[in-house]
């Protein structure tokens, strides 16, 4: 698994809806692959972490003043939807085919 | 200044181009307000940090398994341009009105 010493990357994160209390309204799936963005945004920022100009600037300032300014952060830069089956107010199962922003597609330094 | 104990917010970050070695090509300004996103993404995530569904999920998983999964991260979610006067390849001073992505407009939890 990618720790703080490794570079920013997408790692596995299986989420069980019961663990987060969403099983009260999500019928299926019981769990899904959410992924997590883990690792550091170290100088020099590689192209694969698609840094913004601000992230590059902040990284350079952090190099100069590490106690004053933090590093850029490894976060999801593109998310994917999943399909979920949920209970409506009347307990009727209904499908949301395109439930946005639930799974990480790409990570980057921001 | 917003520390790790405070909520995700935009804080001041004055960047001097000489400090980051960009004074070799940026003529003016000498420094600018880049801002920085600082603070934690704590449960419950407020609307003003515009959390994605993934950020909400990750926050809930972090609550349940704090050592296994990190919190969402406070990062720039919207950037603003600045105007810069820079030297082109031939050393000619050139004005770029919209040098994109240089300053934080908004912070959020991702």
């Amino acid at each position: 698994s990618a720790g703080a010493g490794s570079h920013c990357q997408k790692t596995s994160l299986r989420v069980n809806f019961e663990d987060i209390g969403w099983d009260s309204w999500i019928i299926a799936p019981k769990e899904y692959e959410a992924y997590e963005c883990k690792g550091g945004c170290f100088f020099p920022l590689a192209d694969d972490v698609t840094p913004t100009k601000h992230a590059i600037v902040q990284t350079l300032v952090h190099l100069k003043f590490p106690t004053k300014v933090g590093k850029a952060c490894c976060v999801p830069t593109k998310l994917s939807p999943i399909s979920v089956l949920y209970k409506d107010d009347m307990g009727v199962p209904t499908l949301k085919y395109h439930y946005e922003g639930m799974s990480v597609a790409e990570c980057g330094c921001r | 200044s917003a520390g790790a104990g405070s909520h995700c917010q935009k804080t001041s970050l004055r960047v001097n181009f000489e400090d980051i070695g960009w004074d070799s090509w940026i003529i003016a300004p000498k420094e600018y307000e880049a801002y920085e996103c600082k603070g934690g993404c704590f449960f419950p995530l407020a609307d003003d940090v515009t959390p994605t569904k993934h950020a909400i999920v990750q926050t809930l998983v972090h609550l349940k398994f704090p050592t296994k999964v990190g919190k969402a991260c406070c990062v720039p979610t919207k950037l603003s341009p600045i105007s810069v006067l820079y030297k082109d390849d031939m050393g000619v001073p050139t004005l770029k009105y919209h040098y994109e992505g240089m300053s934080v407009a908004e912070c959020g939890c991702r």
Epitope: P29, K30, S83, D89, M90, K96, Y97, H98 | -
Partner: antibody
């Protein structure tokens, strides 16, 4: 009991327009994401488009073949879903179903022919 | 040509076990979201199951599995009333909605 009842199908000439309705009951219609799916004679299922609930912004998405010609709307006060079909083509001939993904109506036949 | 590929036909005798495959041929479609519909002659499609969820009224003779880029529907103890079309469906991220396989016509012989 969940019920979805489509109406408004019929024969129309190429270039013409038609509005389909889907009356819903037995579930919280205002919270549901509703889709239209069609089935050409002797063919498979084809997604037409979807409208999200108002609480999820009420946005619509459409399949490429109908984009710009078809419009999905909803009236939550009447528990009714609509499909406005303009500039109809012969290839739009199909049975049109409204669906929550879990529940489907019986379908209404649209025939586009000169 | 559908991005979810199914065999056009399948058959078996009463009591037999039949499987219908569904192969994903597009990177925009995650096998995770694939589910199945049944359409009996002259009727509307009906959800067979979605992940672990099986609607009331759907026989436990139907089961599904996923492996790699393929999903399978298995029917055990085949009965004459199972005759009809079976469609796999997935979430096409680019299309922002469901995409259906071409359908498999199941014939119960004898």
């Amino acid at each position: 009991e969940v019920q979805l009842v489509e109406s408004g199908g019929g024969l129309v000439k190429p270039g013409g327009s038609l509005r389909l309705s889907c009356a819903a009951s037995g579930f919280t219609f205002s919270n549901a994401w509703m889709s239209w799916v069609r089935q050409a004679p002797g063919k498979g299922l084809e997604w037409v488009g979807r409208i999200k609930s108002k609480t999820d912004s009420g946005t619509t998405d459409y399949a490429a073949p109908v984009e710009g010609r078809f419009t999905i709307s909803r009236d939550d006060s009447k528990n009714t879903l609509y499909l406005q079909m303009n500039s109809l083509k012969t290839e739009d001939t199909a049975v049109y179903y409204c669906t929550t993904g879990t529940y489907w109506g019986q379908g209404t036949l649209v025939t586009v022919s000169s | 040509q559908s991005v979810l590929t199914q065999p056009p036909s399948a058959s078996g005798t009463p009591g037999q076990r039949v499987t219908i495959s569904c192969s994903v041929t597009n990177p925009d479609i995650d096998i995770f979201n694939v589910h199945w519909y049944q359409q009996l002659p002259g009727t509307a499609p009906k959800l067979l199951f979605f992940h672990e969820y099986r609607p009331s009224g759907v026989s436990d003779r139907f089961s599904g599995s996923k492996s790699g880029t393929s999903a399978s529907l298995a029917i055990v103890g085949l009965q004459s009333e199972d005759e009809g079309y079976y469609y796999c469906a997935g979430l096409d991220e680019a299309m922002r909605g469901p995409v259906f396989g071409g359908g498999t016509k199941l014939t119960v012989l004898g």
